[in-house]
């Protein structure tokens, strides 16, 4: 079955860096847009970044643009999020999620990982 | 960006009763709206897309309705396992925005 497993979260100081990974299985990874969605403690969901199936096209929410880099390795069925210049407001559980492959499905996220916690604090 | 306002913030319902959750968009999203369920410590799960189409495997007691700016998620015959926070998401303007969530508690 479809599985997404995030890793790489942890405690980091403001200004620091972290690299998150998301290992995918149970589907043809290279066919799908994948994104990172985050959730600050006790808060709602916030889309962060998306990457096209080939990895050639990316898009970021403005608050992270220039600091975060989304990438993927289709040979390893893995998605990455390189986070630099981290701020306290980046503290959140980071989920990777698959955009549905359903024809005319739009930006619906049909499978999610369990999330990895990133804490930015001194 | 399109802002989604969910109400109420918290809803307390007895087992077997009906829960009605509202989501209002700041401008029309046609029917391009999804609902997700998130249980404590778990990832969100897609329930409804296209405002009213149930995702595969989602029980029939979950139903979505609405179009334009006003949407409703109805949970009939509420069960204990339905205790969760529910989020609406518009995808009219990619990649979409989420509402603030409605927490459903079981009395």
């Amino acid at each position: 079955q479809v599985q997404l497993v995030e890793s790489g979260g942890g405690l980091v100081q403001p200004g620091g860096s972290l690299r998150l990974s998301c290992a995918a299985s149970g589907f043809t990874f290279s066919y799908y847009d994948i994104q990172w969605v985050r959730q600050a403690p006790g808060k709602g969901l916030e889309w962060v970044s998306s990457i096209s199936p080939s990895g050639q096209s990316t898009y970021y929410r403005r608050e992270v643009k220039g600091r975060f880099t989304i990438s993927r390795d289709n040979s390893k069925n893995t998605l990455y999020l390189q986070m630099n210049s981290l701020r306290a407001e980046d503290t959140a559980v980071y989920y990777c999620a698959r955009r549905t492959g359903r024809e005319e499905g739009g930006w619906i996220f049909d499978y999610w990982g369990q999330g990895t916690l990133v804490t930015v604090s001194s | 960006e399109i802002v989604l306002t969910q109400s109420p913030a918290t809803l307390s319902v007895s087992p077997g009763e009906r829960a009605t959750l509202s989501c209002r968009a700041s401008r029309s999203v046609r029917r391009e709206l999804a609902w997700y369920q998130q249980k404590p410590g778990q990832a969100p799960e897609l329930l409804i897309y296209g405002a009213s189409t149930r995702e595969t495997g989602i029980p029939a007691r979950f139903s979505g309705s609405g179009s334009g700016t006003d949407f409703t998620l109805t949970i009939n015959s509420l069960e204990a396992e339905d205790a969760a926070t529910y989020y609406c998401q518009q995808y009219r303007d990619p990649p979409g925005t989420f509402g603030g969530g409605t927490k459903v508690e079981i009395k």
Partner: antibody, heavy 118, light 110 residues
Framework: REQLEESGGDLVKPEGSLTLTCTAS?????????VCWVRQAPGKGLEWIGC???????TAYASWAKGRFTISKTSSTTVTLQMTSLTAADTATYFC???????????WGPGTLVTVSS | DVVMTQTPASVSEPVGGTVTIKCQAS??????LAWYQQKPGQPPKLLID???DLASGVPSRFKGSGSGTEYTLTISALECADAATYYC????????????FGGGTEVVVK
């Protein structure tokens, strides 16, 4: 390498119809791209015609283009622009362009020339 | 539809000089603004998105700024290769408001 190429440009008589095709290579439209058509009359500026979100099928058109122009995703690598009731004012180079998630265009085709004349 | 008004229509500056191009939107487009460079016989090339973010490979001599309805492209240390026509473009809420280009500014390098 990801590329777009337009085809179908031709000399057509006034009131005639024409379908242009935008073909992707190095990637497919199975992802959610905005694929848009933009035209440029000889010696003039860029004019947006319309777009299709290849992931959802949503379309958006310039006010003046509604009714006469139709954008469709016809396969995982092709998007078409159907044009009807053509007039001399539609003479232009027609470009297709791609944006990811939003419609700023980091990939353009070289353009195809449409001439409407009797 | 959003309307983009671009000024001036043409500007001539010497090599090493600075060019400023302005673009006004008919409504607040929340910085969803791109700038393109187009040379004769070629398709446009993306220079800047989100009003101020340089596209990959674009030199830092190109600078975008602005918010709300008022946006500016500044080209400093002008080079001969910068001779081209420049267009602004809004892409705010495409499904609702569509896409709109400015009328273009021809930059002549003396």
């Amino acid at each position: 390498r990801e590329q777009l190429e337009e085809s179908g440009g031709d000399l057509v008589k006034p009131e005639g119809s024409l379908t242009l095709t935008c073909t992707a290579s190095g990637f497919s439209f199975s992802s959610s791209y905005w694929v848009c058509w933009v035209r440029q009359a000889p010696g003039k500026g860029l004019e947006w015609i319309g777009c299709i979100d290849t992931g959802s099928g949503n379309t958006a058109y310039a006010s003046w283009a509604k009714g006469r122009f139709t954008i469709s995703k016809t396969s995982s690598t092709t998007v078409t622009l159907q044009m009807t009731s053509l007039t001399a004012a539609d003479t232009a180079t027609y470009f297709c362009a791609r944006g990811y998630v939003v419609a700023h265009f980091n990939l353009w085709g070289p353009g195809t020339l449409v001439t409407v004349s009797s | 539809d959003v309307v983009m008004t671009q000024t001036p229509a043409s500007v001539s500056e010497p090599v090493g000089g600075t060019v400023t191009i302005k673009c006004q939107a008919s409504e607040d487009i929340e910085r969803y603004l791109a700038w393109y460079q187009q040379k004769p016989g070629q398709p446009p090339k993306l220079l800047i998105d989100d009003a101020s973010d340089l596209a990959s490979g674009v030199p830092s001599r190109f600078k975008g700024s602005g918010s709300g309805t008022e946006y500016t492209l500044t080209i400093s240390a002008l080079e001969c290769a910068d001779a081209a026509t420049y267009y602004c473009q809004s892409y705010y809420a495409i499904s609702t408001y569509g896409v709109a280009f400015g009328g273009g500014t021809e930059v002549v390098v003396k």
